[in-house]
Amino acid sequence: MRTEAQVPALQPPEPGLEGAMGHRTLVLPWVLLTLCVTAGTPEVWVQVRMEATELSSFTIRCGFLGSGSISLVTVSWGGPNGAGGTTLAVLHPERGIRQWAPARQARWETQSSISLILEGSGASSPCANTTFCCKFASFPEGSWEACGSLPPSSDPGLSAPPTPAPILRADLAGILGVSGVLLFGCVYLLHLLRRHKHRPAPRLQPSRTSPQAPRARAWAPSQASQAALHVPYATINTSCRPATLDTAHPHGGPSWWASLPTHAAHRPQGPAAWASTPIPARGSFVSVENGLYAQAGERPPHTGPGLTLFPDPRGPRAMEGPLGVR
């Protein structure tokens, strides 16, 4: 639902109460308040499911609930991407999908959700206590990541209820983008309101929906999200993570996606020429305007059969997720 601020109507100030600055200082806070309230907070959800048919096969499903356009999705295990996690798949809305063993099939379920099937056998197979994380890079919200794992007592075929992240954060990209402007605006608004505290306040005509109504609260993160924003990243080590995947690798240039073909190829392909392209080390989200995208995390370059490319499942677009439905 697109949330609209219900701003109380201002009565004309009484003569003598306001100076020349009056109108400006009164109007600006309400404009900023409107911006703050209408800036919907995105949410990422993760569901981990063990398949009943193959007891060590997992399906990870993640979705983005926000109003921005997705520029990259990264799925990792063993903890958040960039905090000890190992990348399983990277899905780019235009340039395709890259995945690494034991990931078997990554795909877009909708234009705002993805799924990933993990192979159940071999040294690199996951186990029940593995943590899986999904990171959605979007504009203008920045990067939002959620993690989930299978409950210890889960029966095969059952799944953990998909919930927003125990670990969830907005990366620098969002703060530097529009979110940054809004954040500054909100801080400035508080500053203005504080300054106004000792001045006579204008009479407010109550509106049908007060700013405290649940409707106006929709811009704030969910309680889980709010708590999660304060949770520092923890490196989660599990006995299921193959040690070989943690080896360092040469730093590649930021344009590693450029080598991905964009032609239609629905079937999984074998190792391609671009498969040996070094993947850059984790660390930065570079502005979408530069045509550079989130780094894929610390992974050695793979050239084995686990590497698959599917071209773009959706075009670049302004999303219509639940927090911004048209």
């Epitope: 609930l65 379920e109 239609a264 071209p311 773009d312 670049p316 997720g321």
Partner: antibody, heavy 118, light 111 residues
């Protein structure tokens, strides 16, 4: 306003193929997926698959994987669906529908009736 | 595949009364915040029309007498008060995973 204009009714013989079209207007054709849905006379709705017109990427309902082929022409903002090896079971109305991020369908074509008869 | 079971298959409601249509999914199609379930109305000879998205979000232009609720596996479409023009078949649809599926439909008749 958004419009999806589908091609006219088709009468085909068993074993033949048909190709129907869905011309989009009123929005950026490459910005959303185009989905196809089947409805047999007096029956419910079945999702066939989608195509991303921007790249040609497709996903199919397994049931229709060997029956339908989805394509798109960006230059004419037209999506196509070809049905092959037709049988009487394929006699139905076929709709194209514009998807959105959550894959609900707010815009539908008027439907193309396919009749398979010897 | 996720199976959507709609009930009842048909329903006759008096003008001005409440019509309640149920849709049950064979597995959860919800996150903690949103449900990937949508409702459509279809009249004879016409394509379906979107009424509700994400279980409870009314599509623009759809009368407020239509409302949706539910999460997880159980969803409900309510129409109150029912009007003559609401005579149609109603379908639920999930978009939780591929393949998307529709319910079998509920035919609403106004008495």
């Amino acid at each position: 306003q958004v419009q999806l204009q589908q091609s006219g009714a088709e009468l085909a013989k068993p074993g033949a193929s048909v190709k129907m079209s869905c011309k989009a207007s009123g929005y950026t054709f490459t910005s959303d997926w185009m989905h196809w849905v089947k409805q047999r006379p007096g029956q419910g709705l079945e999702w066939i698959g989608y195509i991303n017109p921007s790249t040609g990427y497709t996903e199919y309902n397994q049931k229709f994987k060997d029956k339908a082929t989805l394509t798109a022409d960006k230059s004419s903002s037209t999506a196509y669906m070809q049905l092959r090896s037709l049988t009487s079971e394929d006699s139905a109305v076929y709709y194209c529908a514009r998807g959105s991020s959550g894959s609900w369908f707010a815009y539908w074509g008027q439907g193309t009736l396919v009749t398979v008869s010897a | 595949d996720i199976v959507l079971t709609q009930s009842p298959a048909s329903l006759a409601v008096s003008l001005g009364q409440r019509a309640t249509i149920s849709c049950r999914a064979s597995q959860s199609v919800s996150t903690s915040s949103y449900s990937y379930m949508h409702w459509y109305q279809q009249k004879p000879g016409q394509p379906p029309k979107l009424l509700i998205k994400y279980a409870s979000n009314l599509e623009s232009g759809v009368p407020a007498r239509f409302s949706g609720s539910g999460s997880g596996t159980d969803f409900t479409l309510n129409i109150h008060p029912v009007e003559e023009e609401d005579t149609a078949t109603y379908y639920c649809q999930h978009s939780w995973e591929i393949p998307y599926t529709f319910g079998g439909g509920t035919k609403l008749e106004i008495k």
